[in-house]
Interface confidence: medium
């Protein structure tokens, strides 16, 4: 009897080991299939969106990541209130599960656009480093389904990089002109979005609770039109201490005014940054590591 019990234990352990190995193989197969599908990404092929089949709809990139897809690339998502799915770049590095809402990399896209374009989104949803704005409507759908953290990755022309991170990033609805709400700051680039670099300047420098403005829809706190002067759509105040949709300049101080890609607390108003990625992920994101 004793021998029989020991044999049972040994067999159970073996079964558990085999189950674990099968799971690992499944994950590996999934990743290999992904890699196979994403080979087109850098070639800029039309069909670069990774087709996950119709097994389920994902509300954001964190769900995709936690379902075992660990390769960065374009995926289709459908936030809870969104009437349709749309493509988005998922950054599966940096802890994974990041939904990229904006990217600036080379000046290939025109960001001096009107209200409708910023509302619906525009840009290159094909190439890995393509520039785009996901769309204010989509930002609203995304950020109302749960509490999100916004991470902004910034790089300058001297090969330096910094980041700013905000808890509880929310974008209002159309009725509220896609108003910006941000929570607690952390990071290395300084708090330009909340204007928390001087107690006396918040009234004009903060982007907190600012409505979105474009050249054809002016909701800023300025006598003039910030979006027109700065040639971009953004949550302008009077006018900005951050503007990541500004004009792309191919050098650090080539701007003749402050209309470049600006993060004041890092490089001031007159330095236009080389690259920016704005990405979001649920506050309580926990990677599902198999």
């Amino acid at each position: 009897l004793e021998d029989c019990a020991q044999e049972q234990m040994r067999l159970r352990a073996q079964v558990r080991l085999l189950e674990t190995r099968v799971k690992q193989q499944q994950v590996k197969i999934k990743q290999l299939l992904q890699e196979n599908e994403v080979q087109f990404l850098d070639k800029g092929d039309e069909n670069t969106v990774i087709d996950l089949g119709s097994k389920r709809q994902y509300a954001d990139c964190s769900e995709i990541f936690n379902d075992g897809y660990k390769l960065s690339g374009f995926y289709k998502i459908k936030p809870l209130q969104s009437p349709a799915e749309f493509s988005v770049y998922c950054d599966m590095s940096d802890g994974g599960g990041w939904t990229v809402i904006q990217r600036r990399s080379d000046g290939s896209e025109n960001f001096n656009r009107g209200w409708k374009d910023y509302e619906n989104g525009f840009g290159n949803f094909v190439q890995k480093h393509g520039e785009y704005w996901l769309g204010n409507k989509n930002l609203h759908f995304l950020t109302t389904q749960e509490d999100y953290t916004l991470k902004i990755d910034l790089a300058d022309f001297e090969k330096n990089s910094r980041y700013a991170q905000y808890k509880n990033f929310k974008v209002g609805d159309e009725k509220n002109f896609y108003e910006l709400n941000i929570g607690e700051y952390s990071g290395t680039a300084g708090d330009s979005l909340a204007g928390n670099f001087h107690p006396e300047v918040q009234w004009w420098a903060s982007h907190q609770r600012m409505k979105f403005s474009t050249w054809d829809r002016d909701h800023d706190n300025y006598e003039g039109n910030c979006a027109e002067e700065d040639q971009s759509g953004w949550w302008f105040n009077r006018c900005h201490s951050a503007n990541l949709n500004g004009v792309y300049y191919s050098g650090p101080y080539t701007a003749k005014t402050d209309n470049g890609i600006v993060w004041y607390t890092w490089h001031g108003w007159w330095y236009s940054l080389k690259s920016v990625v704005m990405k979001i992920r649920p506050n309580d994101f926990i990677p599902n590591v198999i």
């Epitope: 300084g190 670099f197 001087h198 107690p199 006396e200 108003w269 007159w270």
Partner: antibody, heavy 120, light 113 residues
Framework: EVQLVESGGGVVQPGRSLRLSCAAS????????MHWVRQAPGKGLEWVAL????????YYADSVKGRFTISRDNSKNTLYLQMNSLRAEDTAVYYC?????????????WGQGTLVTVSS | EIVMTQSPDSLAVSLGERATINCKSS????????????LAWYQQKPGQPPKLLIY???TRESGVPDRFSGSGSGTDFTLTISSLQAEDVAVYYC?????????FGGGTKVEIK
């Protein structure tokens, strides 16, 4: 090398006006907020006024509000202080000073100053 | 407005000795959002404009000798010259840049004993 050179000081009667200038060189003038700070003979420092990099924001000390106007011409790299209704207590050396920037209002470069004497 | 009070008004210290200047603000100049003290120290020699020594209460300006150091937080601050040199004879001012109007302390004159 950063240089700030004030001019326009002199002796003026109470109630009259004077315009000070500060010529800036050696840095991108249009990128920085600028200040005027004054120092009465044998006394301490008193901040007078501040203007933002683009001229859109101006702040003044209560003692000069309504009488002094700070302005700038970025195309000429020049800062100005228009002083009206001058009083004896405005007698001082007036310094223009560059703001360090990046969310701070302290002064990293100062001019040599220009003396304004208000006397009848 | 924030009133800055410096003490002592004047100070005589032997060469090589430590000089300590105090500065007190009527309200805190520590900004909780970034945990920084909005306070600077300047040195002014006779017939010259002031020169920036310290900002953010304790950060030394580049080119300033390391015998100068700043400390303190909230409302109480100190400028220390660890080993007084002849060229340090000057008037020293603290300045708050937490709020408008920007204000200076009355100055402390440092002389050699």
């Amino acid at each position: 090398e950063v240089q700030l050179v004030e001019s326009g000081g002199g002796v003026v009667q109470p109630g009259r006006s004077l315009r000070l200038s500060c010529a800036a060189s050696g840095f991108t003038f249009s990128s920085y907020a600028m200040h005027w700070v004054r120092q009465a003979p044998g006394k301490g420092l008193e901040w007078v006024a501040l203007i933002s990099y683009d001229g859109s924001l101006k702040y003044y000390a209560d003692s000069v509000k309504g009488r002094f106007t700070i302005s700038r011409d970025n195309s000429k790299n020049t800062l100005y202080l228009q002083m009206n209704s001058l009083r004896a207590e405005d007698t001082a050396v007036y310094y223009c000073a560059r703001d360090r920037g990046y969310g701070s209002w302290y002064f990293d470069y100062w001019g040599q100053g220009t003396l304004v004497t208000v006397s009848s | 407005e924030i009133v800055m009070t410096q003490s002592p008004d004047s100070l005589a210290v032997s060469l090589g000795e430590r000089a300590t200047i105090n500065c007190k603000s009527s309200q805190s100049v520590l900004y909780s959002s970034n945990n920084k003290n909005y306070l600077a120290w300047y040195q002014q020699k006779p017939g010259q404009p002031p020169k920036l020594l310290i900002y953010w209460a304790s950060t030394r300006e580049s080119g300033v000798p390391d015998r100068f150091s700043g400390s303190g937080s909230g409302t109480d601050f100190t400028l220390t010259i660890s080993s007084l040199q002849a060229e340090d004879v000057a008037v020293y001012y603290c300045q708050q840049y937490y709020s408008i109007p920007l204000t200076f302390g009355g100055g402390t004159k440092v002389e050699i004993k």
